[in-house]
Interface confidence: low
């Protein structure tokens, strides 16, 4: 139904918490550059504007689109063009062209300091001054670094974070509460941000059908007992969900994420089993705990796919006469049926069939044509499991660090052209996949690593197309989106990279590694490695271990020594010719 | 052989009320999302509700929202249409369909057809 002021039904439906933290995540988004201090002013004005469209929704400007509220906000910005150049081009256009344009300047990778957790008594000072202020510290800080994070689920991750220093900061020690419990909402925070990043792409490079195939095999796997057209009706539902937070839309988003929520509880009879302690829950959470539901029980009388799929004789009329709902129950009834496939294999599934159909409904005789559909999902359905199995197997061998490294290294090889930084960033979350999904239960691995993996795969491509150097990335990165992952996986050594020079002072290292916290002396090794890869693209694994090895050595060494800055002066130089020789 | 038998059709007043029963056989019912059309005199046949296989999910055409309501029962094989407050303009033949695979319901997506019952609302 059309409301007279959109922004006031907006702040009706959210509650002023919930609006005022979507339009700082909204502005910060945006306008990644911008301190803290500048978008909470702009905030607090189209709040105060929002109240006055409540109390009279015919007040001037009420009716304007929120995006052009917004638009106009952001455009009114003094030194917008010293501050963010081009962006501010953006502002002599007209909506929607004006938003449209804003969306193409978000920055997946901007040039933001890694965020520094402060330590935790400065920590809970501030936050036990002003929790307010120190929670929108954090959704700012989270939403500049990640432009198309799902905006309700960044505010269920600041109620998180609420909740930790509530706990936390009474506690005696108060870092050894916090910094497990911090880590832990980090972890699920960028596994999340990486996960609705993919779902922008798909919907910005594939358009809404992608996406709504996507959200069908999902809810099919969680909900086996709805009906295809409850399925149908959440997988629109969310399609628009997705659309709106991908396009800028927060509290639409919001708004419509919060009714979704609504509706399955109020409709849990035809959906699922398992929702009801979701239900129990207040809006964010009640959310967030349905979209991680636990998948329901498969119905136990369902009959062989191959019955309406294969051995019915009006196969292809049904295809002919409505192709796309067709293959919505086909892949529908595939989903539901395998909770223990990736949403990325099912697809492709889905895709095998219809070329099947589109190939053997044109032939003379089709039932003997497509008969044998289903024999050909074999392979198709092998590859993902080989490929769990033998990194499953590497993980456990040589653990996350380690298993770090292998993929690094292989993909170093495969892409040499591709930055260092970035390299190492994508074989780190890559790598990230054992401690995430190998230690679950056979059933959930396969959909646990391809579809984390694809997320991350996606993650490279987004930074990629920014600065493409690598033919191959290209070739992998511009095909379906479901078949990413296997493209990646098939690449080989790039033999028409030209190795690079080998500089010593790529190899030097000083005292100031030894400070570093674990995490950044694992980067630091992992630069020097994907490097030397770089210059020597075909080292074998021997020769790398031992280089990799001595450079362990050295650093432990040095940073022993009485005088450390001598040490690396005198034994890196060493180590340098020692390394260069070991990968003659 | 698949059979759709409308019944429960008639003549009756403007704001009156009529309770159409679809009664299915040769198919498996529950397997079926069932679906009521309508076509009036020298219009083209619409789809006016339906209802999906396990009855959890609903479909209304705007023009019968409030005053029409579809149900199954699947132990019996059958489709019911409660049409109240009943209008002139609702005049029409309403035929019952059925559909193995129904999504948004529109009409080339139902397989089966009755031969319709004719319901006449008039003063």
């Known amino acids: 139904e059309a409301h007279k002021s959109e922004i006031a039904h907006r702040f009706k439906d959210l509650g002023e918490q919930h609006f005022k933290g979507l339009v700082l995540i909204a502005f910060s988004q945006y306008l990644q550059k911008c301190p803290y201090e500048e978008h909470i002013k702009l905030v607090q004005e189209v709040t105060d504007f929002a109240k006055t469209c409540v109390a009279d929704e015919n007040a001037e400007n009420c009716d304007k689109s929120i995006h052009t509220l917004f638009g106009d906000k952001l455009c009114a910005i003094p030194k917008l063009r010293d501050n963010y150049g081009e962006l501010a081009d953006c502002c002599a256009k007209q909506e929607p062209e004006r938003n449209e344009c804003f969306l193409q300047h978000k920055d997946d990778n901007p040039n933001l300091p890694p965020f520094q957790r402060p330590e935790a008594e400065a920590m809970c000072t501030s936050f036990q001054e002003n929790p307010t202020s120190f929670l929108g510290h954090y959704l700012h800080e989270v939403a500049r670094r990640h432009p198309y994070f799902y905006a309700p689920e960044l505010l269920y991750y600041a109620e998180k974070y609420n909740e930790v220093l509530t706990q936390c900061c009474t506690e005696s020690d108060k870092a050894a509460c916090l910094t497990p419990k911090l880590d832990a909402v980090k972890e699920k925070a960028l596994v999340a941000a990486v996960r609705q990043r993919m779902k922008c792409s798909s919907m910005q490079r594939f358009g809404e059908r992608a996406f709504k195939a996507w959200a069908v095999a999902r809810m099919s796997q969680r909900f086996p007992n709805a009906e295809f057209a409850e399925i149908t009706k959440l997988a629109t539902d969310l399609t628009k969900i997705n659309k709106e937070c991908c396009h800028g839309d927060l509290l639409e988003c919001a708004d419509d994420r919060a009714e979704l929520a609504k509706y399955m509880c109020e409709n849990q009879a035809t959906i699922s089993s398992k929702l009801q302690a979701c239900c129990d829950k207040p809006v964010l959470q009640k959310s967030q705990c349905l979209a991680e539901i636990e998948h329901d029980n498969i119905p136990a009388d369902l009959p062989s796919i191959a019955a309406d799929f294969v051995e019915d004789k009006e196969v292809c009329k049904n295809y002919a006469e409505a192709k796309d709902v067709f293959l919505g129950t086909f892949l529908y009834e595939y989903s539901r049926r395998h909770p223990d496939y990736s949403v990325s294999l099912l697809l492709r599934l889905a895709k095998k069939y219809e070329a099947t159909l589109e190939k053997c409904c044109a032939e003379g005789d089709p039932p003997a044509c497509y008969g044998t559909v289903l024999a050909e999902f074999q392979p198709l359905v092998e590859e993902p499991k080989n490929l769990v199995k033998t990194n499953c197997e590497l993980y456990e061998k040589l653990g996350e660090y380690g298993f770090q490294n292998a993929i690094l290294v292989r993909y170093t090889q495969k892409a040499p052209q591709v930055s260092t930084p970035t390299l190492v960033e994508a074989a780190r979350n890559l790598g990230r996949v054992g401690t995430k999904c190998c230690t679950l239960p056979e059933a959930q691995r396969l959909p646990c690593v391809e579809d984390y993996l694809s997320a991350i795969l996606n993650r490279l491509c987004v930074l990629h197309e920014k600065t493409p150097v690598s033919e191959k990335v290209t070739k992998c990165c511009s095909g379906s989106l479901v078949e990413r992952r296997p493209c990646f996986s098939a690449l080989t050594v790039d033999e028409t990279y030209v190795p690079k020079e080998f500089k010593a002072e790529t190899f030097t290292f000083h005292s100031d590694i030894c400070t570093l916290p674990d995490k950044e002396k694992q980067i630091k090794k992992q630069t020097a490695l994907a490097e030397l890869v770089k210059h020597k693209p075909k080292a074998t694994e021997d020769q790398l271990k031992t280089v990799m090895g001595d450079f362990a050595q050295f650093v432990d060494k040095c940073c022993k020594a009485a005088d450390k800055d001598n040490c690396f002066a005198t034994e890196g130089p060493n180590l340098v010719a020692r390394s260069k020789e070991a990968l003659a | 052989e698949v059979q759709l038998v409308e019944s429960g059709g008639g003549v009756v007043q403007p704001g009156g009320s009529l309770r159409l029963s679809c009664a299915a056989s040769?198919?498996?019912?529950?397997?079926?999302?069932m679906g009521w059309f309508r076509q009036a005199p020298g219009k083209e046949r619409e789809r006016v509700v339906s209802i999906s296989r396990g009855g959890g999910y609903t479909y209304y055409a705007d023009s019968v929202k409030g005053r029409f309501t579809i149900s199954r029962d699947n132990s019996e094989n059958t489709v019911y249409l409660q049409m109240n407050s009943l209008r002139p303009e609702d005049t029409a033949l309403y035929y019952c369909?059925?559909?193995?695979?129904?999504?948004?319901?529109?009409?080339?997506?139902?397989?089966?057809w009755g031969q319709g019952t004719l319901v006449t609302v008039s003063s």
């Open positions: 369909a059925a559909a193995r695979y129904w999504a948004t319901g529109s009409e080339y997506e139902f397989d089966y």
């Open positions: 040769g198919l498996t019912f529950s397997s079926y999302a």
